[in-house]
């Protein structure tokens, strides 16, 4: 598939407003509700909100011979979670990152929280239509990783998962292990 557009979105929105009925407003809304943030402590004495950096991606899906009729919207969960007051500085990697590294022995990463199975149609060059199910990410969350190396290390492979801040019940809807495997 190819990427059409990607926009940066911070996960401050708690509940999205559904699109109004419209023949043009056909892209799927996040089935599992809004994005969210976690309340967590930077250290024992400080409590701040942790924001998750999310990218909203628009993609066309292809199986080689056929391409999706409409682009598909989904979230890409990227990078670190940061205290909300320093989020604006995050992109430049300046004050916010230093603040976070100095004050915490743990890393908070933005990871997939909820997915759902989406049925889509693909239009083929011979005029026929196909249908598939794919799995899309609908929400991200902050997950805590414990540093196993020195405090300034940002080698994420060297981190081990720790207990998440919040538990979000997964939907029962079946999902595939490969994000865009089609069935």
């Amino acid at each position: 598939f190819k990427n059409d557009a990607t926009e940066i979105l911070y996960s401050h929105v708690v509940k999205p407003v559904p699109a109004h009925p419209s023949s043009n407003s056909t892209l799927n809304q996040a089935r599992n509700g809004g994005r969210h943030f976690s309340n967590t402590g930077l250290d024992r004495n400080t409590r701040v909100q942790v924001g998750c950096r999310e990218l909203r991606s628009t993609k066309y899906i292809s199986d080689g011979q056929c391409t999706s009729i409409s682009p598909l919207k989904e979230l890409v969960c990227a990078g670190e979670c940061l205290p909300l007051p320093v989020l604006p500085n995050w992109i430049g990697g300046g004050y916010g990152t230093k603040y976070w590294s100095r004050r915490s022995s743990q890393e908070w990463r933005c990871v997939n929280d909820k997915t759902r199975t989406q049925r889509i149609q693909l239009q083929c060059q011979d005029g026929s239509t196909r249908t598939y199910k794919i799995t899309v990410v609908t929400a991200c969350k902050c997950k805590r990783y414990t540093r196993q190396h020195n405090e300034s290390s940002h080698n994420f492979e060297s981190m081990s998962p720790a207990k998440p801040v919040q538990h979000h019940r997964e939907r029962k809807r079946a999902s595939k292990s490969s994000k865009h495997s089609m069935s």
Epitope: P18, I69, Q121, T129, T131, K133, K172
Partner: antibody, heavy 123, light 107 residues
């Protein structure tokens, strides 16, 4: 015009099997998932499962996994549901229903339904 | 499985009335709620999908609303041809599940 034409009523004996057909026309058969729904007086409407005519892959409601088998014949644009080991509890009207898509995206609604096939299980 | 409840199993109304039929889900279904009309002869038609979007060919007197777990179908100006049973269905989680139906009758 989209049409889903189901096979006629069936009177079958307990323990037997039955195969219901749903012949489609007016649209690209492989472009739409097909669901099957059971309607009985006691249980209202129950979703049995769905099949992808492109791949032949199917997903079942756990309750009907041992009861129903969904298949398709792409050459005739027809969907089938076989029900086995029939008992009186399987007596019902069965519908095929097409998945609705809006500019290529599904909202998990069924936009066109067959007229229903009555299955009566009686000795 | 998600349970869908239509508390009113039958409803009497007069022609021209505004009628509202409600449906409640046992958990949040994130607006993946459809409404169907079943005529006495068994014919089933989709009216509304994704809570409030009107399926093509459906008269504009039908409308849907709701969020979370509570949803409703409204017929703004009841006509004779609207006499039928109405079912809600959630599509948020497999298996898809239906409400028990609300039978609409003329007073």
């Amino acid at each position: 015009e989209v049409q889903l034409q189901q096979s006629g009523p069936e009177l079958v004996k307990p323990g037997a099997s039955v195969k219901i057909s749903c012949k489609t026309s007016g649209y690209s058969f492989t472009g739409y998932y097909m669901s099957w729904v059971k309607q009985s007086p006691e249980k209202s409407l129950e979703w049995i499962g769905e099949i992808n005519p492109t791949t032949g892959g199917s997903t079942y409601n756990q309750k009907f996994k041992a009861k129903a088998t969904l298949t398709v014949d792409k050459s005739s644009s027809t969907a089938y549901m076989q029900l086995k080991s029939l008992t009186s509890e399987d007596s019902a009207v069965y519908y095929c229903a097409r998945e609705g898509y809006y500019s290529g995206i599904s909202y998990d609604a069924m936009d066109y339904w067959g007229q229903g096939t009555s299955v009566t299980v009686s000795s | 499985d998600i349970q869908m409840t239509q508390t009113t199993s039958s409803l009497s109304a007069s022609l021209g009335d505004r009628v509202t039929i409600s449906c409640r889900a046992s958990q949040d279904i994130s607006n993946y709620l459809s409404w169907y009309q079943q005529k006495p002869d068994g014919t089933v038609k989709l009216l509304i999908y994704y809570t409030s979007r009107l399926h093509s060919g459906v008269p504009s007197r039908f409308s849907g609303s709701g969020s979370g777990t509570d949803y409703s179908l409204t017929i703004s100006n009841l006509e004779q041809e609207d006499i039928a049973t109405y079912f809600c269905q959630q599509g948020n989680t497999l298996p898809r599940t239906f409400g028990g139906g609300t039978k609409l009758e003329i007073k």
